[in-house]
Interface confidence: low
């Protein structure tokens, strides 16, 4: 067995993907490991090969079906195991009884686009991707705007406490390049976390009209 501290964290994207990260201090880099998913009330089971993402952590995605298929429900429990090969055997290195709708992380929002841009404001819309119909409107969003000379970490967060797939950014500077990102989170789930940030959308405000007070 491999000694050391182990951490095994997984999230369900609400449709057909469970993403897992396993961290193990002192684990052997050349050991072949996989995640095995065994639902309590489904006829299928699934595995994925853990691939290294850093010195002591590995990640993989359990693809449960077509991207928009609803493979699990709020009553499912999936036993997730990290199995590592030791000779001819697979040894269980970590195990958890995973409640998918208590451990949600949605896909990043997609299809960001500028609906309308002016000198001081910009209206932006987006779409959510592979989100379960179970949520209905029970989603929230965070958005941030990168302005010149600043970093993403410095950007103030704008919170939308409802399923609103657009925003009107105000008090922008004319003729200035900005970038915009948004992320989404269901209200459901004790261990639910924010989605990754969307791909940045670059846009430029219109220049102020000559001879006019801006």
């Amino acid at each position: 067995a491999v000694n050391g501290t182990s951490q095994f964290t997984c999230f369900y994207n609400s449709r057909a993907n469970i993403s897992c990260v396993w961290s193990q201090d002192g684990a052997l880099q050349d050991t072949s490991c996989q995640v095995h998913a065994w639902p309590d009330r489904r006829r299928w089971n699934q595995t994925c090969e853990l691939l290294p993402v850093s010195q002591a952590s590995w990640a993989c995605n359990l693809i449960l079906g077509a991207p928009d298929s609803q493979k699990l429900t709020t009553v499912d429990i999936v036993t997730l195991r990290v199995l590592c090969r030791e000779g001819v055997r697979w040894r269980v290195m970590a195990i958890q009884d995973f409640k998918p709708f208590e451990n949600l992380r949605l896909m990043a929002p997609i299809s960001l686009q500028v609906v309308h841009v002016e000198t001081h404001r910009c209206n932006i819309s987006w779409e959510i991707s592979q989100a379960s119909h179970y949520f209905e409107r029970h989603l929230e969003f965070e958005a941030r705007t990168l302005s010149p000379g600043h970093t993403w970490e410095e950007a103030p967060l704008l919170t939308l406490k409802q399923k609103q797939e657009w925003i009107c950014l105000e008090t922008l500077t004319p003729d200035t390049q900005y970038e915009f990102q948004v992320r989404v989170k269901p209200l459901q789930g004790e261990f639910t976390t924010w989605s990754p940030w969307s791909q940045p959308l670059a846009f430029r405000t219109k220049p102020a009209a000559l001879g006019k007070d801006t």
Partner: nanobody
């Protein structure tokens, strides 16, 4: 160390039912995954079904799905295999197996085995 003893085998007609039991002695029965395998003459031992430590997770080989049901009673240190609608091709020696830390369908992954019980299904 775990000892496993199967019982309940016998000779039945096609379409009838049998219930196999596997009694375990030793500690920590509830920490073992339990499986049933079967062997027909001249063939490899074949995975039939598995039940997880708590009994919440079960899986079956396709050929027995809908006919066989595995269960366990951790208070009695026993695992059961209810076999309904038996067919002649179910004729085999049935073995129960216990795995600590191992969870799979391959026989080499199981640490403890019973001696087997014969099931014969006549047409």
């Amino acid at each position: 160390e775990v000892q496993l003893v199967e019982s309940g085998g016998g000779l039945v007609q096609a379409g009838e039912s049998l219930r196999l039991s596997c009694a375990a002695s030793g500690q920590y029965f509830s920490t073992y995954s339990m499986a049933w395998f079967r062997r027909t003459p001249g063939k490899e031992r074949e995975f039939v079904t598995i039940i997880s430590e708590s009994g919440g997770i079960k899986e079956y080989v396709d050929s027995v799905k809908g006919r066989f049901t595995v269960s366990r009673d951790n208070a009695k240190n026993t695992v059961y295999l209810q076999m309904n609608s038996l067919k002649p091709e179910d004729t085999a020696v049935y073995y129960c197996a216990a795995a600590r830390d191992w969870f799979a369908r391959n026989e080499y992954q199981y640490d403890y085995w019973g001696q087997g019980t014969q099931v014969t299904v006549s047409s």
